[in-house]
């Protein structure tokens, strides 16, 4: 089944996250080894009644630079994202289509490794390798060397001179003309092709389609996402740019969000969908202006890529134990206390019980339950749509999302839940009755 529809054309892109070591880590922990976004794939619209083809995917090599030594063992997360290109308010919408993860052992400098991962109805085929940037060599990129012809012992920028090998290892020589991007060799003189490429020198694409294919009786799985086309040696284009030769040099075709001779300059805008986990992108209509990601509750970072360690803020009162469940924060209260943050003494509400983290609130001699997000009813025992509680203040529009909810604020308001007016009109220096409320404002509003 295609992730796109005739009503909403879409295109796909990938996010790759690398972490060191073999430990099983949560998807939201930092991508300590590095992370990268691919270019957008071609626009695709499903044709009603037509069989589902292989989906058009982003082309080009996706490079994830790592600063320190290559750890040898690493974990990876590859997310396939769908960008819907309809006329929805606020621009394109992004949603996570599939996420695959794994743990691998890989030495730097080795050949391309192939992998197949499945996520639900989707199958992702990809190739990967770790490569040292000169003058680093070795399986961890920790040794420095000089070419056999180099007279000086210190490369430019190396101060003081690091311990250098006397000579670099002689490189493995593949068959003459073997494509440096689509072929590799493990024995001198051979030319073995990456997934999706063929021919004696691995220069012929098997198919122009690629490797994210729905599995099932009608699925065709020829072709795969592989390093991009172009005869440039070593692909000098960074950040997923594709390289083509020119009469004098080379030319990089940069993915959206990057520019410069080698696509090394980031100019990410909201159109590139830089905000993860349902973050709302604001500003950045052109590459020279910055964008800001307004993160939904529970996420932080310039791209909403990090989950907040909300327990570090010690939100639970009266000795309550904090539990960050990912989708929600829970406080396990000591006996005699209740509420989302254990802030209410149960005696205050005369033993009134509110389920699912709801809080008993006193008022005018009566008691009621203020329910946690996602629950409703008299005692908070009924499941509710996260937007049903109207969590967005001041007329903000609520959108349910896979990671929770997002508030789209009305003009003049901001904040994760639109709770802050940018310019409160008619504000005066002294409050009027009732105390603490701004004069002229309604006493309660959504």
């Amino acid at each position: 089944r295609s992730p796109c529809s005739a009503r909403l054309p879409c295109r796909l892109f990938f996010r790759v996250c690398l972490k060191p070591g073999l430990s099983e880590e949560a998807a939201e922990s930092p991508c300590a080894l590095g992370a990268a976004l691919s270019a957008r794939g071609p626009v695709y619209t499903e044709q009603p009644g037509a069989p589902a083809p292989d989906l058009p995917l982003p082309d080009g090599l996706l490079q994830v630079p790592f600063r320190d030594a290559w750890p040898g063992t690493f974990s990876f997360i590859i997310e396939t994202w769908r960008e819907e290109l309809g006329d929805q308010i606020g621009g394109p919408a992004w949603s996570l289509l599939a996420r695959v993860a794994g743990r691998r052992r890989l030495a730097a400098g080795g050949p391309w490794a192939r992998d197949i991962q499945r996520a639900g109805a989707w199958e992702l085929r990809f190739s990967y390798r770790a490569r040292c940037e000169p003058p680093a060599v070795g399986t961890a990129c920790t040794r420095l060397c000089r070419p056999r012809s180099a007279p000086s012992r210190c490369g430019p920028g190396l101060r003081p001179c690091a311990p250098l090998e006397d000579e670099c290892e002689a490189p493995l020589v593949c068959r003459a003309g073997c494509s440096p991007e689509h072929g590799f060799c493990e024995q001198p003189g051979e030319c073995r092709c990456l997934e999706g490429w063929t021919g004696p020198l691995c220069t012929v694409p098997v198919s122009t389609s690629s490797c994210l294919s729905p599995r099932g009786p009608s699925s065709a799985t020829t072709g795969c996402l592989v390093p991009g086309p172009g005869p440039c040696d070593g692909n000098p284009c960074a950040n997923g740019g594709s390289c083509s030769e020119t009469p004098r040099s080379f030319e990089c075709t940069c993915p959206r969000g990057f520019y410069g001779l080698r696509c090394e300059v980031s100019g990410v805008t909201c159109a590139d969908g830089p905000c993860f986990n349902g973050g709302l992108c604001v500003g950045g209509a052109d590459p020279d202006s910055a964008y800001i990601c307004h993160c939904p509750p529970g996420f932080q970072g310039s791209n909403c890529e990090k989950r907040v360690d909300r327990c570090s803020l010690q939100p639970c009162r009266n000795g309550g134990l904090c539990l960050d469940l990912g989708h929600a924060l829970r406080c396990r209260c000591r006996a005699g206390f209740a509420g989302p943050r254990c802030e209410h003494d149960l005696d205050d509400c005369a033993g009134r019980a509110c389920a699912n983290g709801g809080t008993c609130v006193e008022g005018g001699g009566a008691h009621r339950c203020s329910c946690a997000l996602g629950f409703g009813g008299r005692d908070c025992r009924e499941r509710a749509d996260p937007c049903a509680a109207r969590p967005c203040a001041h007329g903000g529009r609520c959108y349910a999302h896979f990671s929770g909810l997002v508030c789209a604020c009305a003009p003049g308001y901001m904040g994760a839940r639109c709770e802050f007016p940018v310019h409160p009109d008619g504000a005066s220096a002294l409050p009027a009755a009732p105390p603490g409320l701004r004069p002229g404002d309604p006493q309660r509003y959504l």
């Epitope: 907040v308 909300r310 509420g339 904040g415 409320l437």
Partner: nanobody
């Protein structure tokens, strides 16, 4: 009912620093999103910085990189650390709270900040 009490205002030379503090007291103070606003003479009151119940923050463009808002849940306070102050930062600074239980808006009395050149 929630009461807000600001402190920390005063006179400072341009380039200097001040730390404003706002203490919230009363009922259900843990359900507050809090912010700092300011109002210069003859101008509208404007948002300076806000912090939501999930800890996410918002800043006015004019103070980004200079001001930092933070909260101490245990003490029910929200602080505004103001560095590299400029004469145009002179204003009365108000503490603001939005209580989610009943969606009431609360304001403090304000504290004067004067930056001299």
């Amino acid at each position: 009912q929630v009461q807000l009490q600001e402190s920390g205002g005063g006179l400072v030379v341009a380039g200097g620093s001040l730390r404003l503090s706002c203490a919230a007291s009363g009922s259900s103070v843990s359900f507050l999103s809090m912010a700092w606003y300011r109002q210069a003479p003859g101008k509208k009151r404007e948002l300076v910085a806000g912090i939501s119940t999930d800890g996410s923050t918002n800043y006015a463009d004019s103070v980004k990189g200079r001001f930092t808002i933070s909260e101490d849940n245990a003490k029910n306070t929200v602080d505004l650390q103001m560095n590299s102050l400029q004469p145009e930062d002179t204003a009365v600074y108000y503490c603001y709270a939005y209580r989610w239980i009943d969606r009431y808006t609360y304001w403090g009395q304000g504290t004067q900040v004067t930056v001299s050149s």
